[in-house]
């Protein structure tokens, strides 16, 4: 009977081990070891035993001890199990962006490592174990699928191997891959909301607002706003899960016509777009022409209004007959027309919308000067010592200057409160004078003395 000790050995790869071979008889005819491993007999041995040192053990092996005793030949094997940690533990790259709500497949590759029976592969989120599997195959590949939520954004995923050699060598060997950070995103299926004018006038400023709710992470979202070939430069305001991009747009005559307004919100590797048609139009204000802006009373004045060829005009609220871009009327200027406004309103249909433009011109009518009985009475009779305010209003454009003088020497205080005295009595010559000429009117002041009452 041949014996071997130790019957089982676990050792690190490239390690050495001492193995004792012994025979059951006292004087074996032969005693030895058969192994492909480099071996060295450790002397001195005994009559019925030998000690060998096996070195550079690279893989599992079963060296065999044999003995030849008088009663027969026998052999015994020792089981050498080599252990080593994996040479490569690698988590497959994660997608640059992972949509929220979509399952994520984690894949880990393990190269090397033995004994495989004692090698476990774990997939981790941070330090939390998601899956634990045995390492099978070379390289071993372990996968697991996990649902992804918003709280996974920025989470670290890794792969860890455990070589558990307990209770043999009372050791647990761990190898961990480089962590991979997950970027999750949530872009709703609804397109952005785009608020913009449907029609925009050349050389005017319009405001475009593009907004979208339900974005995650909102700070990573990008917005693209463009009107035709013109890229807009929006100011972006971020909410909790929403964003609003506001841009000013000014269009030129070259862009006249129908243009596409595009708003795109990009998040992760996805884009949501909204398109809208904007009609760009040119519509100058109508022209109001007066044959002369300043005329003398009695002059005939032609008031003419002309607008865009496709517009319809109204002059002082009266539509052109027939409806069209021109309207005119004739008037004989009266003092009442002085300062009168002539307003032309033009209406143009653009993309089903009515747009309006107004222009106003004022007529100046030169008239007077005038001194009428109504505004400058020819006779006043006042009690002596009473308080009176002489009133005399001259009319005209330009506004006339007025003076009332008695005998060219005594002025009558027009519009001022006076105490009536005998000196005030008499006939005053009131003169109204402007660049258009001069009119005069006599005004008589009678003073009633108390003794005549």
């Amino acid at each position: 009977q041949t014996s071997v000790f130790p019957p089982e050995v676990i050792l690190p790869r490239g390690g050495s081990v001492k193995v004792n071979c012994s025979a059951s008889c006292d004087q074996p005819i032969s005693l030895g070891m058969e192994t492909p491993l480099p071996k060295k007999e450790i002397l001195p041995g005994g009559n019925n035993w030998k000690m060998y040192e096996l070195s550079n053990v690279q893989e599992d092996s079963q060296p065999m001890c044999y003995s030849n005793c008088p009663d027969g030949q026998s052999s015994a094997k020792t089981l050498l199990t080599v252990y080593w940690t994996p040479e490569r533990v690698e988590l497959a790259p994660l997608p640059p962006w992972q949509p929220v709500g979509k399952n994520l497949t984690l894949r880990c590759q393990v190269e090397g490592g033995a004994p495989r029976a004692n090698l476990t592969v774990m997939l981790l989120r941070g330090e939390k174990e998601l899956s634990r599997q045995s390492a099978v195959g070379e390289p071993a590949e372990v996968t697991t699928t996990v649902p992804v939520g918003r709280d996974d954004h920025g989470a670290n995923f890794s792969c860890r191997t455990e070589l558990d050699l307990r209770p043999y060598v009372l050791k647990l060997f761990e190898n961990t891959s480089a962590p991979h950070q997950l970027q999750t995103f949530d872009l709703p299926a609804t397109p952005p909301q785009l608020v913009s004018p449907q029609v925009l006038e050349v050389d005017t400023q319009g405001t475009v607002v593009c907004s979208l709710d339900g974005l995650f992470p909102v700070s990573e979202a990008q917005v693209s706003l463009a009107l035709g070939d013109q890229k807009l430069n929006p100011t972006i305001t971020y909410g909790n899960n929403s964003l609003s991009a506001k841009a000013s747009v000014k269009v030129t005559a070259e862009e006249e016509g129908t243009q596409q307004l595009l708003c795109g919100v990009m998040l992760g590797n996805q884009t949501q777009e909204t398109r809208q048609t904007v009609t760009i139009y040119s519509f100058p204000a109508p022209n109001v022409n007066l044959t002369k802006p300043e005329v003398s009373e009695g002059t005939e004045v032609i008031v003419e209004c002309e607008a865009h060829p496709r517009a319809k005009v109204m002059l002082n609220g009266v539509p052109a007959q027939p409806p069209g871009p021109r309207a005119q009327f004739l008037l004989k200027a009266t003092p009442e027309d002085n300062g009168r406004s002539f307003s032309c309103s033009a209406t143009l249909e653009v993309a089903g919308q009515l747009v309006h433009k107004n222009q106003t011109r004022e007529l100046r009518v030169l008239y007077g000067p005038r001194l009428d009985e109504k505004d400058c009475p020819g006779n006043w009779t006042w009690p002596e010592n009473s308080q009176q305010t002489p009133m005399c209003q001259a009319w005209g454009n330009p506004l006339p200057q007025l003076k009332c003088l008695k005998d060219g020497t005594f002025p009558l205080p027009i519009g001022q409160s006076v105490t009536v005295t005998r000196d005030l009595e008499g006939t005053y010559l009131c003169q109204a004078r402007s660049t258009r000429g001069e009119v005069t009117r006599e005004v008589t002041v009678n003073v009633l003395s108390p003794r005549y009452e």
């Epitope: 200057q401 003076k403 003088l405 060219g408 020497t409 005594f410 000196d423």
Partner: antibody
């Protein structure tokens, strides 16, 4: 339109003197004419006025000492009995009471009267 | 009587400065107050009529105000050319008058 005074000269006290204001470019029937004097180194002193109707009005101190009269183109100021205190430059003024402004406030260059024995 | 009292009799003012001349009528002359500027050897120059209206060609630094019995002439941003004697005149009554003119204010520019 202009006004110009004449007749200023050296007179002995008590010798009556008439100053004449000749107007051109306007009618005296529609304008009042006044007389103002200024003694050497002194202020302006109002003497009197003749209205467009021909009525005359005098400063209280001037009554009896001066007489204002007019023809169609001239206005006269008569110093009835001059004294040395009447030595002054005498100005003729058109419309001193008109409130249309400086187009009517027309002053002559003045004429110097010297009363001395 | 409708007479005018003017103050001060003389005033000294620096170039760029402001001067205020006052006139008081013995009774209300409403707004009928005129102001004149006179330089030595020259006839009076008409400045202001109806208390506050500027005669044509008169710079806006001359300002008249007041009504009734109290009137003021203010000259701001004085220039050396403004050195003269200034007179107020009541232009309301041509009778019952002792003197229609104020006594005058000599303005000396430093």
């Amino acid at each position: 339109q202009s006004v110009e005074e004449s007749g200023g000269r050296l007179v002995t006290p008590g010798t009556p003197l008439t100053l004449t204001c000749t107007v051109s470019g306007f009618s005296l029937s529609s304008h009042a004419m006044g007389w103002v004097r200024q003694a050497p180194g002194k202020g302006l002193q109002y003497i009197g006025i003749i209205g467009s109707s021909g009525s005359t009005y005098y400063a209280s101190w001037a009554k009896g000492r001066f007489t204002i009269s007019k023809t169609s183109t001239t206005v006269d100021l008569r110093l009835t009995s001059p004294t040395t205190e009447d030595t002054a430059t005498y100005f003729c003024v058109r419309d001193p009471y008109d409130s249309f402004g400086d187009a009517y406030r027309l002053w002559g260059p003045g004429t110097l009267v010297t009363v001395s024995s | 009587a409708y007479d005018m009292t003017q103050t001060p009799a003389s005033v000294e003012v620096a170039v760029g400065g402001t001067v205020t001349i006052k006139c008081q009528a013995s009774q209300s002359i409403y707004s009928y107050c005129s102001w004149y500027q006179q330089k030595p050897g020259q006839r009076p120059k008409f400045l202001i009529y109806d208390a506050s209206k500027l005669a044509s060609g008169v710079p806006s630094r001359f300002k008249g105000s007041g009504s009734g019995t109290e009137f003021t002439l203010t000259i701001s941003g004085m220039q050396s050319d403004d050195a003269a004697t200034y007179y107020c005149q009541q232009a309301y009554s041509s009778s019952n008058v002792d003197n229609a003119f104020g006594g005058g204010t000599e303005v000396v520019v430093k």
